[in-house]
Amino acid sequence: IWELKKDVYVVELDWYPDAPGEMVVLTCDTPEEDGITWTLDQSSEVLGSGKTLTIQVKEFGDAGQYTCHKGGEVLSHSLLLLHKKEDGIWSTDILKDQKEPKNKTFLRCEAKNYSGRFTCWWLTTISTDLTFSVKSSRGSSDPQGVTCGAATLSAERVRGDNKEYEYSVECQEDSACPAAEESLPIEVMVDAVHKLKYENYTSSFFIRDIIKPDPPKNLQLKPLKNSRQVEVSWEYPDTWSTPHSYFSLTFCVQVQGKSKREKKDRVFTDKTSATVICRKNASISVRAQDRYYSSSWSEWASVPCS
Amino acid sequence: RAVPGGSSPAWTQCQQLSQKLCTLAWSAHPLVGHMDLREEGDEETTNDVPHIQCGDGCDPQGLRDNSQFCLQRIHQGLIFYEKLLGSDIFTGEPSLLPDSPVGQLHASLLGLSQLLQPEGHHWETQQIPSLSPSQPWQRLLLRFKILRSLQAFVAVAARVFAHGAATLSP
């Protein structure tokens, strides 16, 4: 058993049929010694008396809010949550496996630049009685500070018969050094509580590996005289790190016909313009990637040819 | 050229070669981003290789103030990785494929380090500890981790030379 926060405790249980459970001793936070009784949740049934209460925690029915009273007055509370371990593996019932980039990916994180700011998100099908708390650091043995905000519900989607909820959180490294080469990964830890079930999820990454620039901005076409060719130009996204002579991007320009089956013409360039042939009903798209480190491409910015 | 007295390197040449190094480092291990590299022992390997750190003067302001600190740091790292790529971690069994870019990567590391420090000029003798012997099964993982770290190292070096070529070239 360990304390998650004031008056909230997590009991770690090996979860299998007829498991013996864990013996837990609760102590009433009071100077009083006599006349103390204990109850669980809203029930008025007295579970025991005295300053301490010993219970055997085996299942969710044994978890909940234990309250000690004296003469009708509440003295203190202890909320017990359960953390299940099945076949040596902690349960992951609350969050959905996103399976990208690999199985058992519950948290996904992205950064728009090298400033030390990043966003993580996760999915669940649970709609109520759900709380999250997020902590982060750079490195684990001698952790350096990363400040995370509160997790918020960022999207709701219908997937077949189920509703899916996306939560996200923004974090910022306290003393980020955008130009340096990271040697210690960022660690992100999410505590999830659904009713009386506790679970924790972690992710470890370098900012450089989760970089995904915003799409190029101000994408424009300039027809060239007496030619089917056009000059496409664009700019670095506002959110990208500066100076651009140091934090450089490379770009992919794509000409795509109306039909998905039509052949795509692609040009790669380090410049912020390119000359391409504009076919009728086609569209021109441009995306960006860090020039020197192969992290994710941005989403496409597109304009129609006509 | 970046010589101990402090004259400028051939920024544009360094830019071109460092960008080539980035391409080679990724073609030597393209699937790197899809593998989980935080298995047991990874911290030791990443701690053992050079890193361009915050105080090394490789940020735009530091380069403007005095690029020599950063260039020396990059030079040290290039020599270090060149020695690793020339060691039996890469030359021993299992043999690399004949068309593996590791050979080109090794040569390019040496080439860039020589651009930074031509014959007759010396920063300091490059010291590298004895390498631990490795078995074939260990080499595959070590190669992966070294190339992974090298990708990050040369990315920073390439940014430095690109910025230098754009803003510090005579």
Partner: antibody
Framework: QVQLQESGPGLVKPSETLSLTCTVS????????VHWIRQPPGKGLEWIGV???????DYNPSLKSRVTISRDTSKNQFSLKLSSVTAADTAVYYC??????????????WGQGTLVTVSS | DIVMTQTPLSLPVTPGEPASISCKPS????????????LAWYLQKPGQSPQLLIY???TRQSGVPDRFSGSGSGTDFTLKISRVEAEDVGVYYC?????????FGQGTKLEIK
């Protein structure tokens, strides 16, 4: 928890072979090299040799012709053999471990040591 | 072989006073690439096996009191104890693991005055 335990005869006759065993627990043999170090009574520490995680060995040049280090991974045991011993080989013999990495590491855990006396 | 020269060989100290031990290898232990010094400090208490105090010249092993600190680089290293306590008595050794064979200093015997 991490443990290394040396064992073997406390008395060996001159010209014979000293044989010691180091039994380890609490760590993965894939991740740690195991070393032998000795300390003559009232003197300093001398490195004897190492068996690397991959099974290869390196020995102190001053002892190389007489030393063999081997292992039995199924039993989590490492052995030291030192042939043609003399009174100068009387010492406390320790086994210790270091984390396998690109470069040789430092010894973070040691056994409690076993005294071997060479005498007829 | 790299020769490790430790001084002093004997160090009588009054409890509460600082103590300092020097270790000078015959060649640099600094790896210029990764800026690590391949030097460790050990304390061997009477009748016990050596215990790791400091690694990479200046990183304190977990559980080691913060009165112990290591400094130096290349060919000149120092172990300092800010305020000596009775339990610090024993022999202190430096170890180089830059090249085979690993070599130790001769040891410094710290005793309470």
């Amino acid at each position: 928890q991490v443990q290394l335990q040396e064992s073997g005869p406390g008395l060996v006759k001159p010209s014979e072979t000293l044989s010691l065993t180091c039994t380890v627990s609490g760590f993965s043999l894939i991740s740690y090299n195991v070393h032998w170090i000795r300390q003559p009574p009232g003197k300093g520490l001398e490195w004897i040799g190492v068996i690397w995680t991959g099974g290869s060995t390196d020995y102190n040049p001053s002892l190389k012709s007489r030393v063999t280090i081997s292992r039995d991974t199924s039993k989590n045991q490492f052995s030291l053999k030192l042939s043609s011993v003399t009174a100068a080989d009387t010492a406390v013999y320790y086994c210790a471990r270091d984390k396998y990495g690109l470069f040789p590491g430092y010894f973070d855990y040691w056994g409690q040591g076993t005294l071997v006396t060479v005498s007829s | 072989d790299i020769v490790m020269t430790q001084t002093p060989l004997s160090l009588p100290v009054t409890p509460g006073e600082p103590a300092s031990i020097s270790c000078k290898p015959s060649q640099s232990l600094l790896s210029s690439g990764n800026r690590k010094n391949y030097l460790a400090w050990y304390l061997q208490k009477p009748g016990q096996s050596p215990q790791l105090l400091i690694y990479y010249a200046s990183t304190r092993q977990s559980g080691v009191p913060d009165r112990f600190s290591g400094s130096g680089s290349g060919t000149d290293f120092t172990l300092k104890i800010s305020r000596v306590e009775a339990e610090d008595v024993g022999v202190y050794y430096c170890l180089q693991h830059f090249n085979y064979p690993w070599t130790f200093g001769q040891g410094t015997k710290l005793e309470i005055k």
